[in-house]
């Protein structure tokens, strides 16, 4: 997995006037990490994991980053000619990455109303739009506006892709995210569903990185997919990710079933608790 | 390559007990169960039980509770079945397996003879 | 428990021949029926796994099919060393058990 570093900043539009506030928030490897949700922005790390990477800095920097950009993104909101009344939104999603052979990419996406019209390769500072009309319109509209306005020239494309992977180097000499593997916690429980039957689900929580094998067995032999339920692995506000796995099975066979975790070259296997005992928790 | 060693043949007396081993390689080894199964000599094969090597956790066949003990050694990936209070009707081919996963007894060892005879 | 009937003990066919082996559950098993081959020299064998899933390794000339009770294992073109006994096992249901194995003979 690559590192990465992402902003995702939303600002609002009103009956055809953008409205002062913005919304901004900050990934590092796919982790919720900085926030600014107010009128005037304050960079907020988000947990004690974005703390310990940030260390004793004040966020200054990051604040004034994403003031600017809010500012930017307000201004091109309001070039937008096609504002109907209500509310609107725009977004911009900017990507950068490094790649365990050291190459990066860097890339940023527009997104009205929560669809994608315009994408760039900030490396080759190619624009790529959707096919549909709309998409169209509101790309060019927004091109012609960035054209228009002197920040926007080649040299800054390529500041905004150095700025980006300067950041991210700076967060990952703090050491905390670099290469790190934190283990799950698994733990299994059991509900009643249908009279003989019960539901057996196994949770798999603050873990790092997101990549996991979580499976249900039966006598040793993976149940196949169309007989097993999975939830998205998601991140849990702690620098960590969560997720789980559920299958139905018949009461009293509860022994024949395993479930199976594998997680950064480590595997364990985690019995269904029998009879009263609700969780079986356990950390190998 | 996945492969399961077991100890060589064994002759004991009735009522005295025999521990077969079962060394597994070319895996890693918590990772899959470990099945027992029993042929008599020139009869059907017959499954003891297994055993998840991660945690020790065992099931058996009926038939083979109170007869057969499983158990592992994870420091040498070896499975072992103790067997107790052999009769003549214990006389027989034992073979371990595991599995790969998908299928159940996908690799076997080569078998022990346990003789009882007095 | 399930039993597995293989009603032919034994069997003779010529090389190249298309053999077919049955063997039947004593209830519903699923699909859940694997097949194994026991060489003379007793060196077991999976074959087949969940009806008709090929083991890897296994020749092509091998296939499996079957549903409900009734299961079987075809060898399209007979070789020499496929001289052994055939085992059918259901995993549907504790305690796992095998039918009484079908020994393949050369004419």
């Known amino acids: 997995e690559p590192h990465s570093l992402r902003y995702n900043l939303t600002v609002l539009s009103g009956d055809g006037s953008v409205q002062s506030g913005f919304l901004a928030e900050v990934h590092l490897d796919g982790q919720p990490f900085l926030r600014c949700d107010r009128q005037k922005c304050r960079a907020k790390p988000q947990g004690q994991w974005a703390e310990d990477v940030l260390g004793n800095k004040t966020w200054d920097r990051e604040t004034r980053d994403l003031t600017g950009n809010g500012k930017d993104l307000r201004m091109t909101l309001a070039h937008i000619k096609d504002q109907k009344e209500g509310l609107h939104s725009l977004q911009e999603i900017r990507v950068c990455e490094i790649h365990e052979d050291n190459s990066t990419r860097s890339s940023q996406h527009f997104y009205y109303d929560g669809e994608l019209f315009l994408s760039q390769n900030l490396e080759t500072e190619e624009w790529t739009m959707p096919q549909s009309s709309r998409a169209q319109t509101l790309a060019m509209n927004v091109r012609n506006f960035l054209k228009e306005d002197a920040m926007k020239t080649k040299t800054h494309y390529h500041a905004m892709h150095a700025d980006c992977l300067q950041e991210l180097r700076r967060y990952l000499k703090s050491g905390v995210v670099l290469r790190r593997t934190v283990p799950p916690m698994v733990n299994v429980t059991r509900s009643e569903a249908s009279e003989g039957n019960i539901t057996v689900t196994c949770r798999a929580s603050g873990f790092y990185p997101w990549n996991i094998t979580l499976s249900w067995r039966q006598d040793g032999v993976s149940l196949s997919h169309d007989t097993q339920q999975w939830g998205d692995v998601l991140p849990d506000g702690n620098g960590t990710y969560q997720t789980w796995v559920a299958t139905r099975i018949c009461q009293g066979e509860e022994q024949r079933f395993t479930c199976y975790m594998e997680h950064s070259g480590n595997h364990s296997t985690h019995p269904v608790p029998s009879g009263k005992v609700l969780v079986l928790q356990s950390h190998w | 390559e996945v492969q399961l060693q077991q100890s060589g043949p064994e002759l004991v007396k009735p009522g005295a007990s025999v521990k077969v081993s079962c060394k597994a390689s070319?895996?890693?080894?918590?990772?899959?169960?470990i099945y027992w199964v029993k042929q008599s000599h020139g009869k059907s094969l017959e499954w003891i039980g297994y055993?998840?090597?991660?945690?020790?956790?065992?099931v058996q066949n009926q038939k083979f509770k109170g007869k057969a003990t499983l158990t592992v050694d994870k420091s040498s990936s070896t499975a072992y079945m103790h067997l107790n209070s052999l009769t003549s009707e214990d006389s027989a081919v034992y073979y371990c397996a595991t599995t790969d996963g998908y299928s159940l007894f996908t690799y076997w060892g080569q078998g022990t003879l346990v003789t009882v005879s007095s | 428990d399930i039993q597995m009937t293989q009603t032919t003990s034994s069997l003779s066919a010529s090389l190249g021949d298309r053999v077919t082996i049955s063997c039947r559950a004593s209830?519903?098993?699923?699909?859940?029926l694997n097949w194994y081959q026991q060489k003379p020299d007793g060196t077991v064998k999976l074959l087949i796994y969940y009806t008709s899933r090929l083991h890897s390794g296994v020749p092509s000339r091998f296939s499996g099919s079957g549903s409900g009770t009734d299961y079987s294992l075809t060898i399209s073109n007979l070789e020499q060393e496929d001289i052994a006994t055939y085992f059918c096992?259901?995993?549907?249901?504790?305690?796992?058990?095998f039918g009484s194995g079908t020994k393949l003979e050369i004419k």
């Open positions: 096992q259901q995993g549907n249901t504790l305690p796992f058990t």
């Open positions: 055993i998840d090597p991660y945690n020790g956790g065992t």
């Open positions: 070319g895996y890693a080894f918590t990772k899959y169960n």
């Open positions: 209830q519903d098993i699923g699909n859940y």
